[in-house]
């Protein structure tokens, strides 16, 4: 009975998490992006990024932008604005 309860609670929590984060936000480092944001972000908003690769346990390729508001936003690596920010951030790292 207790196991059923905790399973139910876990299921409820993950549904809630998905609802809060939407498909375009990664809830944690261990979550996969399921879709992409439909917004354009400014480089000043972004502190870093990680790459999600489809062949490494997730369904889609994505760039996960980490923002100054502690949000992780899933973005389409094929879009120009995403490539631009990745290039900017990569340059910054090289120049450090």
């Amino acid at each position: 009975m207790c196991c059923t309860k905790s399973l139910l609670l876990a299921a409820l929590m993950s549904v809630l998490l998905l609802h809060l984060c939407g498909e375009s936000e990664a809830a944690s480092n261990f979550d996969c992006c399921l879709g992409y944001t439909d917004r354009i972000l400014h480089p000043k908003f972004i502190v870093g990024f990680t790459r999600q690769l489809a062949n490494e346990g997730c369904d889609i390729n994505a760039i996960i932008f980490h923002t100054k508001k502690k949000l992780s936003v899933c973005a389409n690596p094929k879009q120009t604005w995403v490539k631009y920010i990745v290039r900017l951030l990569s340059k910054k790292v090289k120049n450090m």
């Epitope: 917004r39 354009i40 972000l41 400014h42 000043k44 908003f45 094929k78």
Partner: antibody, heavy 120, light 107 residues
Framework: QVQLVQSGAEVKKPGASVKVSCKAS????????MHWVRQAPGQGLEWMGV????????TYAQKFQGRVTMTVDTSTSTVYMELSSLRSEDTAVYYC?????????????WGQGTLVTVSS | DIQMTQSPSSLSASVGDRVTITCGAS??????LNWYQRKPGKAPKLLIY???NLADGVPSRFSGSGSGRDYTLTISSLQPEDFATYYC?????????FGQGTKLEIK
């Protein structure tokens, strides 16, 4: 020099659609976004959405979602903005404006504007 | 969406005056702010980008400052051609919202 030339004024009936064009010249068309901004009589500037001519990616303001469509023809360096289900509140001057990553995502060049009048 | 609030909404000033227009964002926009000038019957013109940078061809009497949620456009010595409406714009994240505008009129 950079130029954005828009199509002429339009008069439309409520419920109809309008399609405004914006022809770009003087720069590499696919390297810059194109925004659409409108100004209704006595009102301020209102951002409608943006299109990336390199891949036709679009994002629209929530207010226009489902009513606006932005498209691009790279062969003629032209961007189009179509607004459907027109109502009297859509009477405004519509501008295309080039979006420039290099100058902090600013709109650095603007078309001359297209007056769209919605009247029965 | 991020809301932008400009003040004042209108302002009367004389040639030679120093004028300040303020723009407040509903949340921190980290300097992702641009200023535009619009004259009647003309397309808007970019004045300041990235909160502080002067756009090409814009006279040095225009300057921008601010950070976080609060930003300012200053005209150090008003010229006759500066009487127009000024708009701030958030570009941190779409939708790129504008302030409601500040109309600068001749006193």
């Amino acid at each position: 020099q950079v130029q954005l030339v828009q199509s002429g004024a339009e008069v439309k009936k409520p419920g109809a659609s309008v399609k405004v064009s914006c022809k770009a010249s003087g720069y590499t068309f696919t390297n810059y976004w194109m925004h659409w901004v409108r100004q209704a009589p006595g009102q301020g500037l209102e951002w409608m959405g943006v299109i990336d001519p390199s891949d036709s990616y679009t994002t629209y303001a929530q207010k226009f979602q489902g009513r606006v469509t932005m498209t691009v023809d790279t062969s003629t360096s032209t961007v189009y903005m179509e607004l459907s289900s027109l109502r009297s509140e859509d009477t405004a001057v519509y501008y295309c404006a080039r979006g420039n990553y290099g100058v902090d995502y600013a709109m650095d060049y603007w078309g001359q504007g297209t007056l769209v009048t919605v009247s029965s | 969406d991020i809301q932008m609030t400009q003040s004042p909404s209108s302002l009367s000033a004389s040639v030679g005056d120093r004028v300040t227009i303020t723009c407040g964002a509903s949340e921190n926009i980290y300097g992702a702010l641009n200023w535009y000038q619009r004259k009647p019957g003309k397309a808007p013109k970019l004045l300041i980008y990235g909160a502080t940078n002067l756009a090409d061809g814009v006279p040095s009497r225009f300057s921008g400052s601010g950070s976080g949620r609060d930003y300012t456009l200053t005209i150090s010595s008003l010229q006759p051609e500066d009487f127009a409406t000024y708009y701030c714009q958030n570009v941190l994240i779409t939708p790129y919202t504008f302030g409601q505008g500040t109309k600068l009129e001749i006193k």
